[in-house]
Interface confidence: medium
């Protein structure tokens, strides 16, 4: 018979016949002969390899390295590389996750509206009119002004998107 | 020169309570948001629990919720970590910390809490 020119799914073309691919999870050792099956052998412990395959070699799982900034999120299998994600209070600086940097702060005059999580960064918003921040935060909202009024006080000093009010005592009119 | 000094930490049986105080210097105390790391034997820093600057927002890491309290006295340039039912794997050195925008820049030297019976 003609030697095949191609072979089904799964399957791979060596020495003019069809032999199988590893499934993942496996590595080759030797390709089939006209006697003998694909050879193929489990990755070891940190290893993977994620697709029907004729690679002789398995992949080594990422690492997660701590002076980065980075922890595992999923553990690696035969069959899948090992994840990454940021430790609290950092972010990944790329979708691979190769590593993370510190959530950025919101600076005065600007309060937190999103909180920042493993992906994505601190998203800060204008403190708008009746609100302040006077402080540089990853955490912190903006706040309401002081209330004069509920403390029996009048404003002495307007507040801004930076400052709360300053209250003072109501003159006294003399009798 | 900033300089960060942890104490409070000790001895202490699983169930107990610690309260951790961190005495700041240098910089400008009630305009820093400050953290609290701890590095348990033969492990890599784990983040805690951090506070803003006016002390008004906390966060916890999900493995203290519920049983430690991060509070801070601005007129004292002073950070705390109230330590309730404490357990063994709390066991760590413990690190308050300051920031800048791209690093924790300020390390205290740790206070170490051994949570054992």
């Known amino acids: 018979p003609e030697p095949p020119t191609a072979c089904r799914e799964k399957q791979y073309l060596i020495n003019s016949q069809c032999c199988s691919l590893c499934q993942p999870g496996q590595k080759l050792v030797s390709d089939c002969t006209e006697f003998t099956e694909t050879e193929c052998l489990p990755c070891g412990e940190s290893e993977f390899l994620d697709t029907w395959n004729r690679e002789t070699h398995c992949h080594q799982h990422k690492y997660c390295d701590p002076n980065l900034g980075l922890r595992v999120q999923q553990k690696g299998t035969s069959e899948t590389d090992t994840i990454c994600t940021c430790e609290e209070g950092w972010h990944c600086t790329s979708e691979a996750c190769e590593s993370c940097v510190l959530h950025r702060s919101c600076s005065p005059g600007f309060g937190v509206k999103q909180i920042a999580t493993g992906v994505s960064d601190t998203i800060c918003e204008p403190c708008p009119v009746g609100f302040f921040s006077n402080v540089s935060s990853a955490f912190e909202k903006c706040h309401p002004w002081t209330s004069c009024e509920t403390k029996d006080l009048v404003v002495q000093q307007a507040g801004t998107n930076k400052t709360d009010v300053v209250c003072g005592p109501q003159d006294r009119l003399r009798a | 020169e900033v300089q960060l000094l942890e104490s409070g930490g000790g001895l202490v049986q699983p169930g107990g309570s610690l309260r951790l105080s961190c005495a700041a210097s240098g910089f400008t105390f009630s305009h820093e948001d400050m953290t609290w790391v701890r590095q348990a034997p033969g492990k890599g820093l784990e983040w805690v629990s951090s506070?803003?600057?006016?002390?008004?927002?906390?966060y916890y890491a999900d493995s203290v919720k519920g049983r430690f309290t991060i509070s801070r006295d601005n007129s004292k340039n002073t950070l705390y970590l109230q330590m309730n039912s404490l357990r063994a794997e709390d066991t760590a050195v413990y690190y308050c910390?300051?920031?800048?925008?791209?690093?924790?820049?300020?390390w205290g030297q740790g206070t170490l809490v051994t949570v054992s019976s």
């Open positions: 910390a300051k920031r800048t925008r791209s690093k924790f820049d300020y």
């Open positions: 506070i803003s600057p006016n002390g008004w927002d906390t």
